[in-house]
């Protein structure tokens, strides 16, 4: 056959799906590899094609679309599962083509079992709730596309193993699950089960993530330098090594880039011929605020080093600090000599 | 050395004509990122230098022009503060096939490029030029069949071949070509397309079609009640879901609590060909929260939204 | 017959927006491009915008680009123009007009008056 | 963008005279031109495209010629009727423009 645009496969879409559970898969060739999409290609006679390779096999074949009631059915750009089979896992390929034109896109689909408490090897999607902020919702995700506006499905949400039910500060809402005021002891994993029916046959689709409580935006603050600070002095003799801990704390911020950075007169570390190493360490508190040390060491400092000026920069969504070190050349004791 | 391939990008080139391919994979490259362009797995990166022939220009591999011997697979890397990922792109060169008219004619590229016409319409074909900013592209010039098109059913426009009436002896082979500057040196490039020509067809395929809303936005007062349609056209046997959504829930979900946004019960109109479809969504009051959110139609594949604007000042 | 009408003209005020309308009849709409052009009371005629038959290819004069959006719906054999931030030198008749050789217009509509004033 | 500019504005003719109308462009546009005639309170109508190919239903009295810049409309004998304002325009780039206008008015 002539030549198609493989793109190989696509390990980007790590696709995981439940055993016994619909699945309606779109094909990526469209969402991410080919300028047009699935409309204009089909308008201009181009024929969208599926198979697949089981797992720990070679040998692609077509996908058998013939399977009573219609376990596994293509419509538009989307594979549909009613329901999966977990000796379904296996590399899927997308191929469009024509006479003239060919393009083809695989990618991994694993289908995953899951426990009677929902748990399973599934990649759980994280969603950060600000702690006491306020009502919050979180929704049951990617169940688009699976039944008509007309269909009302039942959602059934639970933490952990346990059905939500009179919580206090919990409340099921239909495809959303509102947190009255979000504390740390709501962290952990939530799963809403939606239930729905289609041509007599019912379908559960179970949907779980995990929240984690973290800092709100009310209480954050720009970058607080807690070493160096005025009451410590780094006072070294030459030949001593010389260390100073740059420790930074950052309140939490959504999406924020938490940068901490020393410069030695002026300049960056890299810059400069000293030899200087820097060592970070990074620890967070349960509402993912972080404190970031770096620690500036120069193995045998030089008078000359004990003259520089050393600051430690930070910097996040909420602003820019910096601070000096207290450096200085130790004076030696004076020696009494006895005439 | 820890980076994930991600996957491989076959291209067939001519020689002794510019090229150049850009990296990006966008749920990667929208971030902050950098990339590095190496060939056939060499430690050593593509050069920066904008007077090599072959160059790295921000995220693009250039080259001015591409040579027979330049075939081989390039590898970007593009790394981001905890990442690493690999895209291949395996370049084939092949020598030009000159036309048979003569020696000076234009190369005879077959695969490079197919595009369609449409039968009776007016309709237009397209060269696809893709460069970095440092290319100049000259205006463009189209040919067929190894003759420069001239005529009154053709216009140039942009990178656009305009065709008005296409009739059936409009298929064939095209070649659009333009001068590229770059650095004050000129080179050619020339794209071949093949063109087919498509029949009268009736209602065209079976995605559905949004014809309102257009992606546009709606100037609304504050407080007020809003009824906007989605209309859309689709095949008689669809199964297509039509419905509102925003922030990708549906509308009815979203504003569950309050019910202040609700869909409305879907209607059609049967054509001979097709149905059209009305579902509107009601704003019982625009509240302040709602300026600048798409609110979104789908239809099946095809989405189309509205953003709701406040109404320019009224300084009388 | 060949005909175009316009609709939804009127009087608006700077800053705000209007949609115009153009339904066409007498020919099949979805072979040809259609294009908007305007004519200030007592001017020439100013080209504003064009849009394929497949809404492929659109086109706008400067003076209202980014302003202005042209759509149409085959389905209802309808032309469309969304004009955003309207100012007083809009301030215009406007036609619409089926292409011909895609960018010449063999059939006007009467046009629809379009006034921008506060 | 190609600026058209039409001469005269204004032509003062009888009825049976020979009337010469002169479009020029401001770069070539190949023979990408048409002539429109406007009465009014009345919308353009298409005369003449692509320099000199007559419209449906236009008399054999209208003709045009030219190509590159320099583009004429004649009208050989005037009627009654072909007393109103006559326009250029191009279609050989984006923008398409339009020339400002020739009134042809009874002398």
């Known amino acids: 056959s002539e030549r198609c645009d493989d793109w190989g496969l696509d390990t980007m879409r790590q696709i995981q799906v439940f055993e016994d559970e619909p699945a309606r898969i779109k094909c990526p060739l469209f969402e991410h590899f080919l300028k047009f999409n699935y409309s204009t290609a089909h308008s201009a006679g181009l024929t969208l094609i599926w198979y697949w390779t089981r797992q720990d096999r070679d040998l692609e074949e077509p996908i058998n679309f013939r399977l009573p009631e219609n376990r596994i059915s293509k419509e538009k750009d989307v594979l549909w599962f009613r329901p999966t089979l977990l000796n379904d896992t296996g590399n899927y390929t997308c191929m469009l083509r024509n006479t003239t034109y060919c393009s083809k896109v695989a990618f991994p689909l694993e289908v995953v079992q899951k426990d009677s408490c929902f748990n399973s090897p599934m990649k759980l999607p994280v969603h950060k709730l600000y702690i006491e902020y306020g009502i919050q919702r979180i929704t049951c995700p990617n169940v688009d596309g699976y039944f008509p506006s007309s269909v009302k499905p039942t959602i059934t949400w639970y933490m952990g193993c346990y059905k939500i039910q009179n919580f206090n500060n919990v409340i099921p809402e239909g495809m959303n699950l509102s947190f009255l005021i979000a504390l740390i002891s709501n962290n952990g994993n939530y799963t809403c089960v939606v239930t729905y029916p289609e041509n007599g046959r019912t379908f559960h689709l179970t949907r779980t993530l995990t929240v984690k409580v973290v800092g709100s935006p009310k209480n954050a603050v720009p970058p607080v330098i807690h070493s160096p600070n005025d009451h410590v002095v780094y006072e070294k003799e030459p030949g001593e090594e010389l260390l100073i801990p740059c420790t930074v704390y950052f309140s939490f911020l959504m999406d924020s880039r938490n940068e901490v950075w020393w410069t030695i007169d002026g300049k960056k570390p890299d810059d400069i011929t000293i030899d200087v190493t820097i060592n970070e360490s990074i620890s967070h508190s349960r509402t993912e605020d972080e404190t970031r040390t770096q620690i500036l060491s120069i193995k045998k400092v030089t008078s000359e080093d004990l003259k520089r000026s050393y600051v430690c920069h930070a910097r996040s969504a909420k602003g820019e600090v910096a601070k000096a070190a207290k450096v200085k050349q130790k004076v030696p004791a004076p020696r009494y000599t006895v005439e | 050395d820890g980076c994930k391939d991600i996957f491989m990008k076959n291209e067939i080139l001519s020689a002794s004509q510019p090229f150049a391919f850009n990296c990006t994979f966008p749920p990667i490259t929208s971030g902050e990122v950098s990339v590095t362009w190496y060939k056939n797995s060499s430690k050593i990166p593509v050069s920066k230098i904008i007077q090599s022939r072959i160059h790295q220009d921000e995220t693009w591999i250039l080259f001015l022009p591409m040579e027979w011997g330049d075939s081989g697979v390039y590898q970007c890397v593009i790394k981001g503060r905890d990442s690493c990922h690999r895209i291949h792109v395996n370049l084939t060169v092949f020598e030009k096939h000159w036309c048979d008219t003569s020696i000076g004619g234009l190369p005879n590229l077959s695969d490079e490029y197919k595009q369609i016409l449409h039968l009776g319409k007016d309709d237009s074909l397209t060269c696809h030029l893709h460069f970095p900013k440092s290319c100049v592209l000259g205006p463009i010039k189209w040919y067929k069949d190894c003759n420069e098109i001239k005529g009154e059913r053709f216009t140039v426009l942009e990178t656009r071949l305009l065709v008005s009436n296409v009739s059936a002896e409009d298929r064939g082979n095209y070649a659009c070509q333009a001068i590229l500057t770059h650095s004050g040196k000129q080179y050619e490039v020339l794209n071949g397309i093949t063109v087919s020509i498509t029949e009268r067809a009736g209602y065209g395929g079976s995605v559905p079609k949004i014809i309102y809303p257009k992606n546009h936005s709606i100037e609304v007062q504050l407080g007020t009640t809003l009824i906007v349609d989605c209309n859309v056209t689709d095949t008689k046997d669809n199964t297509n879901l039509r419905c509102w959504r925003v922030n990708n829930t549906l509308v009815d979900d979203y504003y569950d609590e309050s019910k202040r946004i609700r869909e409305g019960v879907e209607t059609h109109v049967s054509f001979r060909e097709h149905n059209l479809y009305t579902v509107n969504i009601t704003f019982l009051e625009v509240k302040m929260e709602d300026y600048g959110l798409p609110f979104m139609c789908h239809a099946g594949v095809s989405t189309a939204y509205i953003i709701l604007q406040l109404p320019a000042p009224d300084f009388r | 017959e060949v005909q175009l009408v316009e609709s939804g003209g009127g009087l608006v005020q700077p800053g705000r927006s209007l949609r115009l309308s153009c339904t066409a009849s007498g020919f099949t709409f979805d072979d040809y491009a259609i294009h908007w052009v305007r004519q200030s009371p007592g001017k020439g005629l100013e080209w504003v915008s064009v849009?394929?038959?497949?809404?492929?290819?659109?086109g706008y004069a400067d003076s209202v680009k980014g302003r202005f959006t042209i759509s149409r719906d085959n389905a209802k054999n309808s032309l469309y123009l969304q004009m955003n931030s309207l100012r007083a030198e809009d301030t215009a008749l406007y036609y619409c007009a089926k292409g011909y050789n895609w960018n010449f217009f063999d059939y006007w509509g009467q046009g629809t008056l379009v006034t921008v004033s506060s | 963008e190609i600026v058209l500019t039409q001469s005269p504005a204004t032509l003062s003719l009888s009825p049976g005279e020979r009337a010469t109308l002169s479009c020029r462009a401001s770069?070539?546009?190949?023979?990408?031109l048409a002539w429109y005639q406007q009465k009014p309170g009345q919308a353009p109508r298409l005369l003449i495209y692509?320099?000199?190919n007559r419209a449906t239903d236009i008399p054999a009295r209208f003709s045009g010629s030219g190509s590159g810049t320099d583009f004429t409309l004649t009208i050989s004998s005037l009627e009654p009727e072909d007393f109103a304002v006559y326009y250029c325009q191009q279609r050989s780039n984006w923008p398409l423009t339009f020339g400002g206008g020739t009134k042809v008015e009874i002398k």
């Open positions: 849009i394929s038959w497949n809404s492929d290819v659109i």
């Open positions: 770069q070539s546009v190949s023979s990408y």
């Open positions: 692509n320099a000199a």
